[in-house]
Amino acid sequence: EPKFTKCRSPERETFSCHWTDEVHHGTKNLGPIQLFYTRRNTQEWTQEWKECPDYVSAGENSCYFNSSFTSIWIPYCIKLTSNGGTVDEKCFSVDEIVQPDPPIALNWTLLNVSLTGIHADIQVRWEAPRNADIQKGWMVLEYELQYKEVNETKWKMMDPILTTSVPVYSLKVDKEYEVRVRSKQRNSGNYGEFSEVLYVTLPQMSQFTCEEDFY
């Protein structure tokens, strides 16, 4: 049966919900899937259900709620129906489903190189997603940076931080690294998608070594 896979709000001003629409072998044709929603304004369960306002904008098997349909103050319940029967239902507040867009504009600068010339430290910087209103406190994002050597498969994870820059220590010179960052609303469980990968190529060791003057 169809099931909700995810509801997500990128910025606390809109949200969308997605569902599976797989037809399993041997199951009868369910007919068209519709999404209905109600805002749980009261303790009574008698409120009217309304159909999804926009089945198109968030892609296939989805419902998009623009800012006119979204309020952070009121919990929502949504249900999937087919042939008049409910096949899945869930309730949430918008704050529970915040999953920010990826951080943008990643870049790096060299901090220093070890005396041996084998390791280097860099500072990685990025910007919050454009639609996240950080200044007003409308969103409070924490970030997780991951990095690895290009030929490795396992990413190293750094502790979550609230700033948009972080030093990465002890990278090997002459290696190329991949760096990516993702964010989540503080105290909510869902990280957003990762940023585009930033490639860090540390210059050759010879570029760091200075010939000392001898008098």
Epitope: R39, R40, S68, S71, W73, I74, G137, R186
Partner: antibody, heavy 125, light 107 residues
């Protein structure tokens, strides 16, 4: 019993600062949002700011944005309103109020169900 | 910001009268409207939440209704203790707003 008690009001000169406190009992400020609402003498109610301390969300009315800062200390179960660059038009009784949309399996309605008694802030030279 | 236009700003009525106060939202606010009663020198008290639900302990002579973006507070039979100022409030937009208030006075 749910209770909200404001303190910290008083007389302050224009350009000065003041910090208001809203001590909560009977519920956790981390599970609700705390709002500040003010009322100038003889005028209506004006929403000022709110904080959802669990998520760290804050929001401000345009009239106080950049001058007022709302915060909460969940260990003290208290919310604060730091007011800087005060103006004569900030003179008002300041109330804190609770909004709890849902919790404990119950759906609550829209509205501030508990209010403090208010604290008077007078900005005058 | 969403504006809440409340009317009338004041009214005179007698004990036993039916009183109606209205608020019009500048845009759709679903049913995210509350009504409060405030007496001089006191904090506001919640009467109606979510447009039409009576808050616990509030007398049943108070009721709320919604028609689109128009919201109404009705006092079916005014009592002496009901002389006060009444405010509507919307909690739909990210910035919360109140109506200007309606003062209910003794005729």
């Amino acid at each position: 019993e749910v209770q909200l008690v404001e303190s910290g009001g008083g007389l302050v000169q224009p350009g000065g600062s003041l910090r208001l406190s809203c001590a909560a009992s009977g519920f956790n400020v981390s599970s609700s949002s705390i709002h500040w609402v003010r009322q100038a003498p003889g005028k209506g109610l004006e929403w000022v700011a709110y904080i959802s301390s669990y998520y760290g969300y804050t929001s401000y009315a345009d009239s106080v944005k950049g001058r007022f800062t709302i915060s909460a200390d969940t260990s003290k179960n208290t919310a604060y309103l730091q007011m800087n660059s005060l103006r004569a038009e900030d003179t008002a009784v300041y109330y804190c109020a609770r909004y709890q949309s849902y919790g404990g399996g119950y759906w609550f309605g829209v509205g501030f169900d508990y209010w403090g008694q208010g604290t008077l802030v007078t900005v005058s030279s | 910001d969403i504006q809440m236009t409340q009317s009338p700003s004041s009214l005179s009525a007698s004990v036993g009268d039916r009183v109606t106060i209205t608020c019009r939202a500048s845009q759709s606010v679903s049913s995210a409207v509350a009504w409060y009663q405030q007496k001089p020198g006191k904090a506001p008290k919640l009467l109606i939440y979510s447009a039409s639900s009576l808050y616990s302990g509030v007398p049943s002579r108070f009721s709320g209704s919604r028609s689109g973006t128009d919201f109404t507070l009705t006092i079916s039979s005014l009592q002496p203790e009901d002389f006060a100022t009444y405010y509507c409030q919307q909690m739909w937009g990210s910035l919360i707003t109140f109506g200007q208030g309606t003062k209910v006075e003794i005729k």
